[in-house]
Structures are given as structure tokens and as C-alpha cells.
Interface confidence: low
Amino acid sequence: MGRARDAILDALENLTAEELKKFKLKLLSVPLREGYGRIPRGALLSMDALDLTDKLVSFYLETYGAELTANVLRDMGLQEMAGQLQAATHQGSGAAPAGIQAPPQSAAKPGLHFIDQHRAALIARVTNVEWLLDALYGKVLTDEQYQAVRAEPTNPSKMRKLFSFTPAWNWTCKDLLLQALRESQSYLVEDLERS
């Protein structure tokens, strides 16, 4: 299968260090289906996203591992990420809801939008943030959000601030950002698409 494992890994790799720590702590107390054991605390707390994914799959298998991961993410308040994880593991059943553009089928990692897949790289590498803001202003960003991003002193912190608003965005909103990135830093998008 493999798809569920990849989706779990994508979700965990998109957590911040603090969120990953919180995820592990919640995993220690989340209710489990009958017949499943708990990952030992000592091993769990030292794991990175990759090790944790492998452990989740070996302990709970792919389907239940993905479901359990989504439950913990939801419990952490990361509803969109949980939804994306479940969408990725059940992909192929029906069309996208009206008004929300389906993810491109060529996407390397199903269920995650390009800008979510490459969050860290975009924070690190986007230089033309002002251009992005102008492209998104009034369509995706409110005046308050626009000003909040502009107020940040460095490009990475501007991008980090911009990403703090994306959990509320649908695919169309994220596509607008991707389109703006293609227009302002096409080489960067192409580089990330190849990676």
C-alpha cells in the first residue's frame, strides 16, 4: 500500500518541533482500539518524524495508524491537517466539493498542497514577499493580515507569519499563493517541484 504511511509522514513532517512533542505526549494517552498496545514512552519521546512514522505503522499498521494519527492531530486542534491526512488515505473516492479545486494529480505527495509540502523551504527561500502580499491582498488576505505580515522584520519571519494564516485556507486560496509564487519566483517553484 504505502500511501497511508507517506501521508502520516507528510503530516508529522509538517509539525513544528513543539507540535511534534505535543503529538507524542498525546499519543501516550490517546484511547486505543482493543488489541493494540502503546508505543513505549522512552522510545517515543526521542523519535523524529520518520522514526515515529515507522513505529506507528509497525505498531498499528497503515490504516489504523493513519486514523490514530488523524485523531491525535484533531485533538491538538489541527483539524485541517487531520482532514488532509484522512483525505490522502482515502483518495480516489469521488470528486472534490464544489468551489474547491482538487489537488493536481501530479502532486508528489497526495493530500497535501504544494505550499504545505514545501512550507519549510518556502519560509527559508522566498525573497519577494511584498510581491506575494500584493497578489493575495483582498483575495485571501485581510487588511489586518496584510499589515501583520509586512510588519515582520525579515523575509523568513514574514513568510512564517503568512503561513500562520494558511490553516484556514482551502485549495483555491493555496493555489492563489502558488500562482503568485510561480509569477514572482518561478525558478524556486520549479526547483521544489523537482525535489
Epitope: 518541533a17 519549510a120 523551504a121 510588519a151 522584520p153 519571519s157 507569519k161
Partner: antibody, heavy 120, light 112 residues
Framework: QVQLKESGPGLVAPSQSLSITCTVS????????VHWVRQPPGKGLEWLGV???????NYNSALMSRLSISKDNSKSQVFLKMNSLQTADTAMYYC??????????????WGQGTSVTVSS | DVVMTQTPLSLPVSLGDQASISCRSS???????????LHWYLQKPGQSPKLLIY???NRFSGVPDRFSGSGSGTDFTLKISRVEAEDLGVYFC?????????FGGGTKLEIK
């Protein structure tokens, strides 16, 4: 493994300029920022500036007029240039990697430093 | 610029003792994104600084669990539960919430 190594002239005459190169290995400059920090003999650390992964820069405002940071991603090198040096610029100069990839958002690896003495 | 004030300047300890270093900033280090970018570094004699704690309380990889960071807003503390000989050196706090990034003056941990 991650390594940063500074190379500089050692001795610089007053009013002359300083050029230091930071050569990195074990990571890509397209994914990580590099900061410059200096430490006068027996004193504390002073942040000079940073070049982010995308190439944009930020400087310590007190030094901005005579400081410039650039890089060559393909050669894995970051360059610090400072003009009009005075004896107060005598210090150990360090480059340090800035990690956002793992969400540390701190200077997680430092070079061993290069000593710069400003003297005639 | 944000001024970082560390106390004490020098901290004589006996091996096995607990050590505590305080760091105070001239303005809040809580970023608008909710994170607090306060870090601790250790510089051993003749070496470059090494990252110990990032974002207030997170131990960097390979850092022993006897090191812990705490605090919020403008007041932060680094604690070493049982000082070992390899812990001796100068400890610096640093903030990266506001540009320019700034460091504390350092606290020298030495044997009593």
C-alpha cells in the same frame, strides 16, 4: 556532517577592509541561513548580520553602513565584508548556521572562528 | 535594540550542585506568531559557542537532560541539575524575536 569553516586575513591595518569567507559542508545554503557573530577578546558575543536561504540579508544597524554579506550557493560559501576597520573591530569572527528546517530557529552549528586583529 | 541582561556574571559551583542562570530582556520576546525565540548557548574555553536550548525550553540534540530552560515574556532561566566538569564555560542567552538579534553578556560557570 554539518561543518562551517571561516577563513580570514588574520591581520588588518586600520581603515582597511576585512573579507572573511565561511565555507560550509553537510548542508545546502539554499535551505539554511548563515549568521555572522563576533567576539572581542575576553568579551561577549555581538550579532553582525545574516544572509537568509533566499539571499536576503539583515544587518546590525550599528554596523550596517560598513557591512555587507553575500554568498555563492554553488560553492557553498558565504562572504562577510567590512569596511573602515578600527582597533575596536579586533575580534574572533564566527559564522553560524540558522536552522528553520527542523524548526529550531536558532544558530545550531558554529564555525571554529577566525581571529582578526586590527593593527598597524 | 533589545538588551539582554544575564545574572550572575560569575557562578562558582561545586560539582554535583544545581546551578541556575537568569536572563532578562528589555522587552517581551513573545513573537506575534506565538513563539518565544530565546536560546541558550555554551562556550567552553577555547571553543566556539554551542546551542544548548532553543525557544526557551527545548533541548538541542545531544544535550543532556540535566539542562533545562524555562521562563516567558521577559524573564528566563537556565538550570543545570547536577553540574559536571564538562559543563564549565560561559553561558549566553540570545534572542531572535527582534532584529537586531542580541546576546546576553554571559555567565561564567566555574568550580568553587
Amino acid at each position: 556532517q554539518v561543518q562551517l569553516k571561516e577563513s580570514g586575513p588574520g591581520l588588518v591595518a586600520p581603515s582597511q577592509s576585512l573579507s572573511i569567507t565561511c565555507t560550509v559542508s553537510g548542508f545546502s545554503l539554499t535551505s539554511y541561513g548563515v549568521h555572522w557573530v563576533r567576539q572581542p577578546p575576553g568579551k561577549g558575543l555581538e550579532w553582525l548580520g545574516v544572509i537568509w536561504a533566499g539571499g536576503s540579508t539583515n544587518y546590525n544597524s550599528a554596523l550596517m553602513s560598513r557591512l555587507s554579506i553575500s554568498k555563492d550557493n554553488s560553492k557553498s560559501q558565504v562572504f562577510l565584508k567590512m569596511n573602515s576597520l578600527q582597533t575596536a573591530d579586533t575580534a574572533m569572527y564566527y559564522c553560524a548556521r540558522w536552522d528553520y528546517v527542523n524548526s529550531y530557529e536558532a544558530m545550531d552549528y558554529w564555525g571554529q572562528g577566525t581571529s582578526v586583529t586590527v593593527s598597524s | 535594540d533589545v538588551v539582554m541582561t544575564q545574572t550572575p556574571l560569575s557562578l562558582p559551583v561545586s560539582l554535583g550542585d544545581q546551578a541556575s542562570i537568569s536572563c532578562r530582556s528589555s522587552q517581551s520576546l513573545v513573537h506575534s506568531n506565538g513563539n518565544t525565540y530565546l536560546h541558550w548557548y555554551l562556550q567552553k574555553p577555547g571553543q566556539s559557542p554551542k546551542l544548548l536550548i532553543y525557544k526557551v525550553s527545548n533541548r538541542f540534540s545531544g544535550v543532556p537532560d540535566r539542562f533545562s530552560g524555562s521562563g516567558s515574556g521577559t524573564d528566563f532561566t537556565l538550570k543545570i541539575s547536577r553540574v559536571e566538569a564538562e559543563d564549565l564555560g560561559v553561558y549566553f542567552c540570545s534572542q531572535s524575536t527582534h532584529v537586531p538579534y542580541t546576546f546576553g553578556g554571559g555567565t561564567k560557570l566555574e568550580i568553587k
